[in-house]
């Protein structure tokens, strides 16, 4: 672990569990990028005062990275060559291949609200296709 603790959304929340989950996750939505390029996956938790203890990034239930309030970032060994932490609680994917196409999830572990999940669909396009503007619209 690099022990650089990130700037966490959510303050030092307290209180008991079973609360109403008022928060919402805003994401970059559906995005596309060129093969060989890079892309930033971003989520933002808003409308809650819950304390964020950890954010997990997953691709089809496979863990990519963890950002922990105490420990900072951990990148899964199988992705460490192509995944970079940040900016913020986001994740940067590098050297994209068509196999990176799919759904990505940011999972916010919070107290007392519990887990919030945001989803982003990434399509990795061949360079020639990307140049001709066949892109998803960001909502």
């Amino acid at each position: 672990y690099p022990y650089d603790v990130p700037d966490y959304a959510g303050g030092g929340g307290s209180g008991g569990g079973g609360s109403m989950m008022t928060g919402t996750i805003e994401t970059t939505g559906n995005i596309s990028a060129e093969k060989g390029g890079s892309i930033i996956l971003q989520c933002h938790l808003s409308s809650t005062t819950a304390q964020v203890t950890q954010v997990n990034w997953e691709q089809q239930d496979q863990l990519l990275a963890i950002c922990n309030a105490d420990l900072g970032w951990h990148i899964s060994p199988s992705f460490k060559d192509r995944v970079a932490p940040g900016p913020g609680l986001g994740l940067t994917l590098q050297s994209l291949t068509v196999n990176d196409t799919g759904e990505y999830a940011c999972i916010y572990h919070t107290y007392p609200d519990g887990t919030y999940t945001g989803r982003i669909f990434l399509e990795v396009l061949e360079s020639s296709v990307a140049e001709h503007g066949a892109r998803f619209q960001i909502p």
């Epitope: 239930d61 309030a69 105490d70």
Partner: antibody
Framework: EVQLVESGGGLVQPGGSLRLSCAAS????????MHWVRQAPGKGLEWVAF????????YYADTVKGRFTISRDNAKNSLYLQMNSLRAEDTAVYYC????????????WGQGTMVTVSS | DIQMTQSPSSLSASVGDRVTITCRAS??????LAWYQQKPGKAPKLLIY???TLQSGVPSRFSGSGSGTDFTLTISSLQPEDFATYYC?????????FGGGTKVEIK
């Protein structure tokens, strides 16, 4: 090999205090959140408290809030549970358990230490 | 708090049987459910987490499924060492809560 060994249990009178310890070995203790879970005789499991790896997040079950205090000493690879104002209903086997790095459940448990609250 | 209800509370089965245990949450917990096995006088052992992910070292005859409020633990072919009590536990929000347990006994 991951090992968690609890100690400090025993017989105590209602209103008394006890301090449980959990000695961890076989992993980098300072990287993992830790829990205390208890089990009353012949009953099911009840989560008691959690402390994050660096102690920035501490949570308690409502049944023990204000009476129990969870703490840790990463330099000593140790987890603690200070139990005050003990009641008969606190009688149970107390387990310490490690939280998975991804925060998805408790992957290793100690063998437990028995706490009996009785006059 | 989220209530976890397990059924049945006990069952009798024979070696080689397929066994299914269900767990229902009082509100949606997404995929965040774990299953534990406990033998008398021993600590619980993690079998499944996040609904369906097998913990390292756990035999593949154990499997988990479900999401939202309804979950299932299946033992495809019961072995002698599988006779124990099984607990479900939600790890979606604090306080983490457990089901009442299902005791699997020898028929």
């Amino acid at each position: 090999e991951v090992q968690l060994v609890e100690s400090g249990g025993g017989l105590v009178q209602p209103g008394g205090s006890l301090r449980l310890s959990c000695a961890a070995s076989g992993f980098t203790f300072s990287n993992f959140g830790m829990h205390w879970v208890r089990q009353a005789p012949g009953k099911g499991l009840e989560w008691v408290a959690f402390i994050s790896s660096g102690s920035s997040s501490i949570y308690y079950a409502d049944t023990v809030k204000g009476r129990f205090t969870i703490s840790r000493d990463n330099a000593k690879n140790s987890l603690y549970l200070q139990m005050n104002s003990l009641r008969a209903e606190d009688t149970a086997v107390y387990y310490c358990a490690r939280m998975r790095l991804d925060y998805y459940a408790m992957d290793y448990w100690g063998q437990g230490t028995m706490v009996t609250v009785s006059s | 708090d989220i209530q976890m209800t397990q059924s049945p509370s006990s069952l009798s089965a024979s070696v080689g049987d397929r066994v299914t245990i269900t767990c229902r949450a009082s509100k949606s917990i997404s995929k965040y459910l774990a299953w534990y096995q406990q033998k008398p006088g021993k600590a619980p052992k993690l079998l499944i987490y996040s609904g369906s992910t097998l913990q390292s070292g756990v035999p593949s005859r154990f499997s988990g499924s479900g999401s939202g409020t309804d979950f299932t633990l299946t033992i495809s072919s019961l072995q002698p060492e599988d006779f124990a009590t099984y607990y479900c536990q939600q790890h979606n929000e604090y306080p983490w809560t457990f089901g009442g347990g299902t005791k699997v006994e020898i028929k």
